[in-house]
């Protein structure tokens, strides 16, 4: 089941999946002036069996000089600010990631790929947040979000992370005002079935990972 929305946006933070659950799709998008080749894949799909997962299809871009159907509008400053959490992050592979069953690694970049990636996540996907450069984290809990299915609808849990500017006078984590969870109720206040596949595995995996994976960018 695809998640309805993107993970929540946290001011001054970016999110990253360490691994992608089977069923995840990645748009084949090309940078400005390029388009998908006519017979090329529309998206990549994480597929596999119990022992191995990989991305089906390959994205390929070609010059769109003949017909400008895939132009990519340069975002305005406010749009760039909005999109910062989903711009491409590091393709580095933490070693733990390879051993997580039913998941794919970050796909390598392809030639003339767009500067932003759009993933279509599935229920059970976990993403991790980190403050952008120049901001520091005030944690009240895990800096992660999970796509869950509740009452037949998908939603992302609210990451417990606040990013504050280093120059700002900030409160201690214990003094923060609690943030309302999505849909205005505490996470625990639900009486129906919650899909929790792989949550524990991923949480344990995340605990061992270095945060440096967020800091490298595509060359």
């Amino acid at each position: 089941e695809l998640c309805d929305d993107d993970p929540p946006e946290i001011p001054h933070a970016t999110f990253k999946a360490m691994a992608y659950k089977e069923g995840t799709m990645l748009n084949c998008e090309c940078k400005r002036g390029f388009r998908r080749i006519k017979s090329g894949s529309l998206y990549m799909l994480c597929t596999g069996n119990s022992s191995h997962s990989s991305w089906d299809n390959q994205c390929q871009c070609t010059s769109s000089a003949t017909r400008n159907t895939t132009k990519q509008v340069t975002p305005q400053p406010e749009e760039q600010k909005e999109r910062k959490t989903t711009e491409m992050q590091s393709p580095m592979q933490p070693v733990d990631q390879a051993s997580l069953p039913g998941h794919c690694r970050e796909p390598p970049p392809w030639e003339n790929e767009a500067t932003e990636r759009i993933y279509h996540f599935v229920v059970g996907q976990m993403v991790y947040y980190q403050c952008v450069q120049g901001y520091r984290a005030l944690h009240r809990g895990p800096a992660e979000s999970v796509c869950k299915m509740t009452h037949g609808k998908t939603r992302w849990t609210q990451p417990q992370l606040i990013c504050t500017g280093e120059m700002e006078t900030s409160q201690f984590p214990g003094e923060e005002k609690p943030q309302a969870s999505p849909e205005g109720r505490p996470e625990s206040e639900t009486s129906c079935l919650v899909t929790t596949t792989d949550f524990q595995i991923q949480t344990e995996m995340a605990a061992t990972m270095e945060t440096s994976i967020f800091t490298t960018e595509y060359q």
Epitope: L2, D4, D5, D6, M25, L26, N27, C28, E29, C30, R35, R36, L42, Y43, T69, T70, K71, Q72, V73, T86, A114, E116, I118, Y119, H120
Partner: nanobody, 123 residues
Framework: QVQLQESGGGLVQAGDSLRLSCAAS????????LAWYRQAPGKEREFLAA???????LYADSVEDRFTISRDNPKNTVHLQMDSLKPEDTAVYYC?????????????????WGQGTQVTVSS
């Protein structure tokens, strides 16, 4: 509540152009494609074109050389520029929104539909 509202339909002569618009509201459409379909009397609903947030596009072979889809993300609108119209283009044109990447989604599987706008091309 997601709403898709089409506009721009009407009666035109063969060879003319028409530009349809669709205003989408009620959610973020970043991970949704916006698409156009049409349904002629007595026929099934037919996929025409789709576009992603990053403006990657896909067209049905039947309209690729004459129709152009475009998207205005800040305004949450999608347009369909239809050139060199033919009488066989006469149909009700529907705007659609669907989760996932650009692909020719079968009509029964589409997440959200507009009400449709009539396009009539006379010879």
């Amino acid at each position: 509540q997601v709403q898709l509202q089409e506009s721009g339909g009407g009666l035109v002569q063969a060879g003319d152009s028409l530009r349809l618009s669709c205003a989408a509201s009620g959610r973020s459409f970043r991970n949704y494609i916006l698409a156009w379909y049409r349904q002629a009397p007595g026929k099934e609903r037919e996929f025409l074109a789709a576009i992603s947030w990053l403006e990657g596009t896909l067209y049905a072979d039947s309209v690729e050389d004459r129709f152009t889809i475009s998207r205005d993300n800040p305004k949450n609108t999608v347009h369909l520029q239809m050139d060199s119209l033919k009488p066989e283009d006469t149909a009700v044109y529907y705007c659609a929104a669907d989760r996932g990447p650009v692909r020719p989604v079968l009509a029964p599987d589409v997440d959200y539909w507009g009400q449709g706008t009539q396009v009539t091309v006379s010879s």
